[in-house]
């Protein structure tokens, strides 16, 4: 129902703490360069204003839309043009164009330093001094680096952070308590970020229908006992929630997500038998838990899919008269039978089914034409299954770091024009799929691998869109979202690429590498590996292994040497010469 004051309505629904957190996230995601203090000041002003509207909904400006209120706040920031350049032009527009303009200026790769975690003692001191400010800093720092982070989920991660600090800061050895726990939260949050960005990309590029299809497939896998009407209702609601978050309407998004969680918990009987544990939790934990709840047990008596979608006399009529319902039903029925498939694969199968009907239904004998459609799914299913097997075998053989290197070589050959930092980031992220998915039971591997790879490749596409350099990447990124991963997998060595000339300084290292954390050392080595491939795109795996082993040996020797600097300056040039010879 309509409310006299939208801001009062949301403040009442969400409560002060969540309201403030969401407004801080919203401002941080829009204006990514502003300091925490600048944003905290705006948040306080907005909150004070919301309270006046709660007290009197008829007070001045309380009837304005949230976009108008927030946009006016952002546009009142001093030195906006100096700090944000053309984003300031958004402020000359009226709503809703102004908000659209802000959205278009969100930067997926802001030039901000990496978010460094302070050491344990310092962290615990500032947390104890002011937990609210500490958590505000966390929200601000994550939100501005991840401008599409799912806001209600970020509140959940902040809550996790809070609980970990509360627990570990009371321990004697704070460091060993904090580090693994915070690393775990960081890893989960980063995966959550790329997954949500993929959802927003789907929404932005292909509209609500594309996202809703994704949701139908995902929900049908998780809730195979729910009927189609129930799945459609959940998918519609989930689409609305995600549309709001992707569109910067974070208060509405969080409020509607809470409503959806409430609905699911009130209707467990018609949704799933696995929800109770989630439903016993408080709001943020409940919604998070529901979003990754285990699949319900599949009904035992499901008829063969062919009955309604191949053998039925009315297939073409049903398709032509209501494609959304008929193809939605197909996606629902196929997905609930296949929790072992990735959502991407299920959407490809639905697309194949649709294309087959579109081709066949106008023919003289449609059943003869579409009769083999299910058999034609086989190659589409085999391709990702083979991908999983090949890559998990390789991961088991090489371990995570070695697997990342293999992917780095592969992707540098596919798109050597892409910047080395982007290739290294992508390969490291793609390589994590092994640790994340290959250890899972067989029936969970495919959905884990392919849907994770799709999300990472979406980030590759977003970064490439900013500065397009590779025709290979442009080709794969401009197609449909579900075809991206197969497209990237099918890419081979880019024959149009003119190899980079060999520059000794690219492969010159200094003793400071020895004191770097292991992760940073790996990145340095992987940077060198990508550069080697750019120099010799057709180098064999053996040649590259020889060079990288030599390189690792060189680092090991010099980092153990008494006089590290001398070792690097004398042995370094020898290494470069050996590299050139090995690749000649």
């Amino acid at each position: 129902e309509a409310h006299k004051s939208e801001i009062a309505h949301r403040y009442n629904d969400l409560g002060e703490q969540h309201f403030k957190g969401l407004v801080l996230i919203a401002f941080s995601q829009y204006l990514q360069k502003c300091s925490y203090d600048e944003h905290a000041k705006l948040v306080q002003e907005v909150t004070d204003f919301a309270k006046t509207c709660v007290a009197d909904e008829s007070a001045a400006n309380c009837d304005k839309s949230l976009h108008t209120l927030f946009g006016d706040k952002l546009c009142a920031i001093p030195n906006l043009r100096e700090n944000y350049g053309e984003l300031a032009d958004c402020c000359t527009k009226q709503e809703p164009e102004r908000n659209e303009c802000f959205l278009q200026h969100k930067d997926d790769n802001p030039s901000l330093p990496p978010f460094e975690r302070p050491e344990a003692e310092a962290m615990c001191t500032s947390f104890k001094e002011n937990p609210t400010t500490f958590m505000g800093h966390y929200l601000h720092e994550v939100a501005r680096r991840h401008p599409y982070f799912y806001a209600p989920e970020l509140l959940y991660y902040a809550e996790q952070y809070n609980e970990i600090l509360t627990q570990c800061c009371a321990e004697a050895d704070k460091e060993s308590c904090l580090t693994p726990k915070l690393d775990g939260v960081k890893e989960k949050a980063l995966v959550s970020s790329v997954r949500q960005r993929m959802k927003c990309s789907s929404m932005q590029k292909f509209g609500e229908r594309a996202f809703k299809a994704w949701a139908v497939a995902r929900l049908s896998q998780t809730f195979p006992n729910a009927d189609f009407a129930e799945i459609t209702k959940l998918a519609t609601d989930l689409t609305k929630v995600n549309k709001e978050c992707c569109h910067g309407d974070l208060l509405e998004c969080a409020d509607d997500r809470a409503e959806l969680a409430k609905y699911m918990c009130e209707n467990q009987a018609t949704i799933s038998s696995k929800l109770q544990t989630c439903c016993d939790k408080p709001l943020l934990k409940k919604a998070h838990c529901l979003s990754e709840v285990e699949h319900d047990t599949m009904p035992a008596d499901l008829p063969a899919i062919a009955a309604d979608f191949v053998e039925d006399q009315e297939v073409c009529k049903n398709y032509a008269e209501a494609k959304d319902v008929f193809l939605g039903t197909f996606l629902y029925e196929y997905s609930r039978r296949h929790p072992d498939y990735s959502v991407s694969l299920l959407l490809r199968l639905a697309k194949k089914y649709e294309a087959t009907l579109e081709k066949c239904c106008a023919e003289a004998n449609p059943p003869a034409c579409y009769g083999t459609v299910l058999a034609e799914f086989q190659p589409l299913v085999e391709e990702p299954k083979n991908l999983v097997k090949t890559n998990c075998d390789l991961y088991e053989k090489l371990g995570e770091y070695g697997f990342q290197n293999a992917i780095l070589v592969r992707y540098t050959q596919k798109a050597p024009q892409v910047s080395t930092p982007t290739l290294v980031e992508a390969a490291r992220n793609l390589g994590r799929v092994g640790t994340k998915c290959c250890t899972l039971p067989e029936d969970q591997r495919l959905p884990c691998v392919e849907d994770y790879l799709s999300a990472i490749l979406n980030r590759v596409c977003l970064l490439h869109e900013k500065t397009p350099v590779s025709e290979h990447v442009t080709k794969c990124c401009s197609g449909s979202l579900v075809e991206r991963r197969p497209c990237f997998s099918a890419l081979t060595v880019d024959e149009t690429y003119v190899p980079k000339e060999f520059k000794a300084e690219t492969f010159t290292f200094h003793s400071d590498i020895c004191t770097l954390p292991e992760k940073e050392k790996q990145i340095k080595k992987q940077t060198a590996l990508a550069e080697l491939v750019k120099h010799k795109p057709k180098a064999t795996a053996e040649q590259l292994k020889t060079v990288m082993d030599d390189f690792a040996q060189f680092l090991d020797t010099c980092c153990k040497a008494a006089d590290k600097d001398t070792c690097f300056s004398t042995e370094g040039p020898n290494l470069v010469t050996r590299c050139k010879d090995a690749l000649a």
Epitope: R209, A320, A322, D324, V325, A362, A364
Partner: antibody, heavy 118, light 110 residues
């Protein structure tokens, strides 16, 4: 390959009328044929389609008053309860092979004029 | 019922210039089922573009279709005298019964 409409004439309101689309160089059993009309000086209006299998679909506004059939090597459009608003040039058009429900019509007849007037 | 709204109409262009015609759909077309037709006086329409951006064989590459969902554009670059005509967009939807055409845009070449 060509299509040609016939049967258009001046009729009084309420009179039924059947238009015929004759095809040459095309095996009708392999194609979907549409009927589209255009009132004088106005835009195009899709009436309906008959698939090669004989299945028919109509625009929401055309259901009940228009019937498409395929007696042999022709496609007919039967119209009842005609009013002055039905005055238009009626075209038959072939759907691009490989599509069933998409609005892609690659081969059109020259059209036949139907005038409904008292 | 589905509606396709074409703007502007009419539109005029000089020979060698560029013309842009917009077609807005409500609701979204199904699976990029959008076509563009050219119709000259006394002639039936001619299919130029299908699937929003694919050119029918024999149509010059000066004709370019773009867009998705609800917003589509036909761009004619290096306009020739022979391009003077009325252009229609056609849309396909979830139900075949909603198949429809836009109101048309008359292009006048000076």
């Amino acid at each position: 390959q060509s299509l040609e409409e016939s049967g258009g004439r001046l009729v009084t309101p309420g009179t039924p009328l059947t238009l015929t689309c004759t095809v040459s160089g095309i095996d009708l059993s392999n194609y979907a044929i549409n009927w589209v009309r255009q009132a004088p000086g106005k835009g195009l209006e899709w009436i309906g389609i008959i698939w090669a299998s004989g299945t028919t679909f109509y625009a929401t506004w055309a259901k009940g008053r228009f019937t498409i059939s395929r007696p042999s090597t022709t496609v007919d459009l039967e119209m009842t309860s005609l009013t002055t608003a039905d005055t238009a040039t009626y075209f038959c058009a072939r759907t691009v092979p490989g599509y069933s429900t998409a609005p892609y019509f690659d081969l059109w007849g020259p059209g036949t004029l139907v005038t409904v007037s008292s | 019922a589905a509606v396709l709204t074409q703007t502007p109409s009419p539109v005029s262009a000089a020979v060698g210039g560029t013309v842009t015609i917009n077609c807005q759909s409500s609701p979204s077309v199904w699976s990029n089922f959008l076509s563009w037709y050219q119709q000259k006086p006394g002639q039936p329409p001619k299919l130029l573009i299908y699937e929003a951006s694919k050119l029918t064989s024999g149509v010059p590459s000066r004709f370019k279709g773009s867009g998705s969902g609800t917003q589509f554009t036909l761009t004619i670059s290096d306009v020739q005298c022979g391009d003077a005509a009325t252009y229609y967009c056609g849309g396909g939807y979830s139900s075949i019964s909603d198949t429809t055409f836009g109101g048309g845009t008359k292009v006048v070449v000076k």
